[in-house]
């Protein structure tokens, strides 16, 4: 059987908020140069399967064999590394499965620096020690598929070394990527080995390849960018926030409301209050007091901090968020305990993450 090893990332990522878009990371097939590699297209009911490498159609040749749902690469070389995809065309739809092939005999994925001393951060390679380009930090390159909301910034990086120091250039869909190819151009930070595109638009979709080369060799790495157009929706509040809280008289407490909204949201913190001993007005509606709202004079509107609380502060606190499409609200209760009934817990000062997009 052809030899290969399958490396799967089993890290569980937190659930993405609604204004983020994520394509699951492809499986990585690793092979040493000279080995053979076999990959099965993991799509069901595939009537017709087509294959691509780095966005370019892949056909059979003397080293590449395509049989049914299998791709075989005989005598793999580093040039076979890249982002592969198999597309199953059906009568009513099509589906694509992405995977990565990494053909290498030595990859350094450690941190680029030890930083053991505070002076020089790195030592230049001995001028006599000639070396073809190599990747210095493959961790920064693992995420090949980038699905990004329109208007966001995108950064692709290819940290590399070599002697003499290699140069870096970028291709889009296999062709030289020029500044005039996108409105606003792009930025290249050579010291970071990165390509940066601000405010991406749908026409930025495609494959971006860094080519790193010196007189002793050339290496390349391809990223796929998908730009997702935002769809407006009413605000969405993270479940479980704000959270119920308890504190003693004289204590401090903080409520956090985490908001996801493409459209500009307006946040209000509201509390039910009593007026003349009644919680409801003559019209049957509850008496409400706006404690805080987003605006020019309000920082961190998504956090409501209460200091030196009294028993009168106990009750329900409502986080109400609205945008031009609609509104949402969630509430939490504050329990105020007498000083002798302090809740027994480890003393900890924390700030929950807060966000207003």
């Amino acid at each position: 059987r052809p030899s290969f090893s399958l490396v799967e990332d089993t890290t569980l990522e937190p659930e993405e908020p609604p204004t983020k878009y994520q394509i699951s990371q492809p499986e990585v097939y690793v092979a040493a140069p000279g080995e053979s590699l076999e990959v099965r297209c993991l799509l069901k009911d595939a009537a017709v399967i087509s294959w691509t490498k780095d966005g370019v159609h892949l056909g059979p040749n003397n080293r590449t064999v395509l049989i049914g749902e299998y791709l075989q690469i005989k005598g793999a070389t580093p040039r076979d590394s890249g982002l592969y995809a198999c597309t199953a065309s059906r009568t009513v739809d099509s589906e694509t499965w992405y995977f990565m092939v990494n053909v290498t005999d030595a990859i350094s994925s450690g941190d680029d620096e030890d930083d053991t001393d505070g002076a020089e951060d790195f030592v230049s390679e001995n001028s006599n020690n000639k070396r073809a380009p190599y990747w210095t930090n493959t961790e920064k390159m693992e995420k090949r598929l980038h699905a990004v909301p329109a208007a966001n910034t995108v950064k692709f990086r290819c940290p590399a070394g070599g002697n003499p120091m290699p140069t870096m250039r970028w291709l889009k869909n296999g062709k030289e990527f020029k500044q005039e190819h996108r409105i606003g151009g792009y930025k290249v930070r050579n010291q970071h080995w990165s390509l940066i595109m601000e405010s991406v638009v749908p026409s930025d979709k495609g494959n971006y390849t860094c080519v790193v080369e010196n007189e002793y060799g050339s290496i390349n790495h391809t990223y796929h960018l998908d730009v997702v157009e935002r769809s407006p929706h009413r605000p969405i509040l993270q479940a479980g926030l704000p959270a119920n809280a308890s504190t003693v008289v004289g204590g401090d407490v903080e409520f956090v409301c985490k908001v996801y909204s493409d459209a500009q949201p307006h946040i209000q913190w509201i509390k039910h209050v009593e007026k003349n001993g009644s919680k409801y007005g003559p019209d049957g509606l509850p008496y409400l007091k706006v404690l805080k709202h987003s605006g020019i004079n309000s920082s961190n509107a998504e956090v409501l901090a209460l200091f030196n609380v009294t028993e009168a502060d106990a009750g329900e606190y409502i986080c109400k968020v609205s945008n031009y499409i609609g509104q949402a609200n969630q509430s939490a209760w504050l329990t105020v305990l007498p000083k002798q009934q302090a809740p027994g817990r480890e003393k900890e000062i924390t700030a929950s993450p807060d966000y207003l997009e």
Epitope: K20, D112, E113, A119, V148, Q191
Partner: antibody, heavy 119, light 107 residues
Framework: QVQLLESGGGLVQPGGSLRLSCAAS????????MSWVRQAPGKGLEWVST????????EYADSVKGRFTISRDNSKNTLYLQMNSLRAEDTAVYYC????????????WGQGTLVTVSS | DIQMTQSPSSLSASVGDRVTITCRAS??????LNWYQQKPGKAPKLLIY???NLQSGVPSRFSGSGSGTDFTLTISSLQPEDFATYYC?????????FGQGTKVEIK
């Protein structure tokens, strides 16, 4: 050891100009990107501008674009910030900072120089 | 520009407390985030780079975590010299931005 020493600050009228300098020592200056960061009295930090070691990459904050110019002289191990058309809101302590290799963490900072724009 | 929102803006704590400060980015910034400490009249000092790496010479009670949009700076056991203002800083974009700062005061 790494040292960064700013100079050139002072009092200037609105619309005036000032040139800040940052003398660097203790490291190979041309190997590092350098930045200017400012802090208005009682306020937070605000990034102003960055220049890479070979001067081929330069970037400015929107608030200073077209008015400030960053430059460097690697033979003199010195970073500069030419500030023109100064405004009251440019009043701040200006720090020069070295960027960590392969990253943009400011690992060394100068002591800062105060620029006051007032009539 | 990428906005960085720090919380809380200030907090009161005692020596020995565990303190957590959070920073949220308006978009995914990978791990391109640093944390600084600044004391009155002094220049900022780098504590954590690339979200979780401790800068040389910084005490191990400081730690950083997070990636994407949510980041945390934790001081495991607050010491007298830790009372200061802390800033997060993103460098994912070419236009760097800082959080508004969190002032850690003595309770």
């Amino acid at each position: 050891q790494v040292q960064l020493l700013e100079s050139g600050g002072g009092l200037v009228q609105p619309g005036g100009s000032l040139r800040l300098s940052c003398a660097a020592s203790g490291f190979t200056f041309s190997d590092y990107a350098m930045s200017w960061v400012r802090q208005a009295p009682g306020k937070g930090l605000e990034w102003v501008s960055t220049i890479e070691g070979d001067s081929n990459y330069i970037e400015y904050a929107d608030s200073v674009k077209g008015r400030f110019t960053i430059s460097r002289d690697n033979s003199k191990n010195t970073l500069y910030l030419q500030m023109n058309s100064l405004r009251a809101e440019d009043t701040a302590v200006y720090y020069c900072a070295r960027e960590r290799t392969y990253s943009s963490a400011f690992d060394y900072w100068g002591q800062g120089t105060l620029v006051t724009v007032s009539s | 520009d990428i906005q960085m929102t720090q919380s809380p803006s200030s907090l009161s704590a005692s020596v020995g407390d565990r303190v957590t400060i959070t920073c949220r980015a308006s978009q995914d910034i990978s791990s391109d985030l640093n944390w600084y400490q600044q004391k009155p009249g002094k220049a900022p000092k780098l504590l954590i780079y690339d979200a979780s790496n401790l800068q040389s010479g910084v005490p191990s009670r400081f730690s950083g975590s997070g990636s994407g949009t949510d980041f945390t700076l934790t001081i495991s056991s607050l010491q007298p010299e830790d009372f200061a203002t802390y800033y997060c800083h993103q460098w994912y974009s070419t236009l760097y931005t800082f959080g508004q700062g969190t002032k850690v005061e003595i309770k």
